[in-house]
Amino acid sequence: KFSKQSWGLENEALIVRCPRQGKPSYTVDWYYSQTNKSIPTQERNRVFASGQLLKFLPAAVADSGIYTCIVRSPTFNRTGYANVTIYKKQSDCNVPDYLMYSTVSGSEKNSKIYCPTIDLYNWTAPLEWFKNCQALQGSRYRAHKSFLVIDNVMTEDAGDYTCKFIHNENGANYSVTATRSFTVKDEQGFSLFPVIGAPAQNEIKEVEIGKNANLTCSACFGKGTQFLAAVLWQLNGTKITDFGEPRIQQEEGQNQSFSNGLACLDMVLRIADVKEEDLLLQYDCLALNLHGLRRHTVRLSRKNPIDHHS
């Protein structure tokens, strides 16, 4: 339950988050599980711990193994395990299955491909995107924040997409790549079980106390006009309007994008003046149509909840 798979390529940066959360946490200690040897926190080391993050800058094949994180507080110590595998870079262009993140689907226009794990890194735009090892060029491709937008998607756009970015740590730059498959849906009009494009299931969104935060629930329901389709947010299983917190509001009216017939809906949840108690709430993005309901849960976490003095 408290174990997580992570993978990366040799000579690239890899950052792994401890799968356990503190309630609260005072410190997080990391160990090599096999030897029980403590991982240093000094940044001069190639592999070092930084609060809830374990950083490989850069990673080596020999780093593969299971790492233990212990979230410590006066009351309880909570243990998690990160199963890390570092692979050699392939000489050819094929990205093996074991390096692939989850597949995403799109259709026709405005399909988004999110760059996996990027939120763990200190990166600056723009991202570089590749398809089957070729750099993407042309006006149909737009790198926007942490995702790629493809306009007028065609069947030929299906394939493996790699995002590449630079992680900066104390002035030193490290390359990171991540690959996921993109599939293109059928051209005819159809209705399908809702597909939530954002947020990811069990996504943890970092927010700053006192600042505003936006969460976007984005889902697609098929192609062509949909008889019934809706996206909405719930707080702890309660409709926003019934929850009774005026700081937290849904954007009036849903954005409807008929991307060459693909019916997608967005609903933005706006949280004004984020408070501590907001971190305890469960935020559910719900997408529903005649096929049924799909729910993705988002949690908020305070930026750098452990490393307060950095």
Epitope: Q21, K23, T75, L279, L281, R302
Partner: antibody
Amino acid sequence: QVQLQQSGPELVRPGASVTLSCKASGYIFIDSEMHWVKQTPVHGLEWIGAIDPETGDTVYNQKFKGKATLTADKSSSTASMELSSLTSEDSAVYYCTGSTTDYYFAYWGQGTTLTVSS
Amino acid sequence: DIVMTQAAFSNPVTLGTSASISCRSSKSLLHSNGIIYLYWYLQKPGQSPQLLIYQMSNLASGVPDRFSSSGSGTDFTLRISRVEAEDVGVYYCAQNLELPFTFGSGTKLEIK
């Protein structure tokens, strides 16, 4: 909005046991430790112990070991504290209090008044 | 156990003026992570305690910025810049550095 709703006042005989409850709402129950605090005019606020509802793990103030037993029911988001072998010294207001990811005692119940008297 | 010491009463203050409440711990509350685990709570008459300040100097959500706190590892001061009638109650300091967590005996804010 986070709420901790505690059970009503109790009047019990010396030597008996009593169970106080605390129902949590407005947040994910297993994501917050539940602590219990005793308040009397003589000793002020005293920390009794805590439970992690996710695992059922407990930790106690040495002073209250054998006196208090903490439990949590995930299905009903309710934490409970049983107090045994009651004496007049146990007469007090008892609070449940929840933690956040950053600190303990962030949210407090309204308190349960326990009176031990023959 | 860490002992938290407070005076039972504050010096009486006039509404609109500032007030200070002191607290001392028997051991430094500075953790190796650089955080001082000192907390301030206010218990208004007939109510439960409510968190004012966490980790020595951080204002809890919804607490007016009239409240501030400072100190070293063992000596702490809660300051209320412009006392209002609603600030009346007992102020407790507490430590969350180590078990058992302990509270001060409380300081009652008195209005002239």
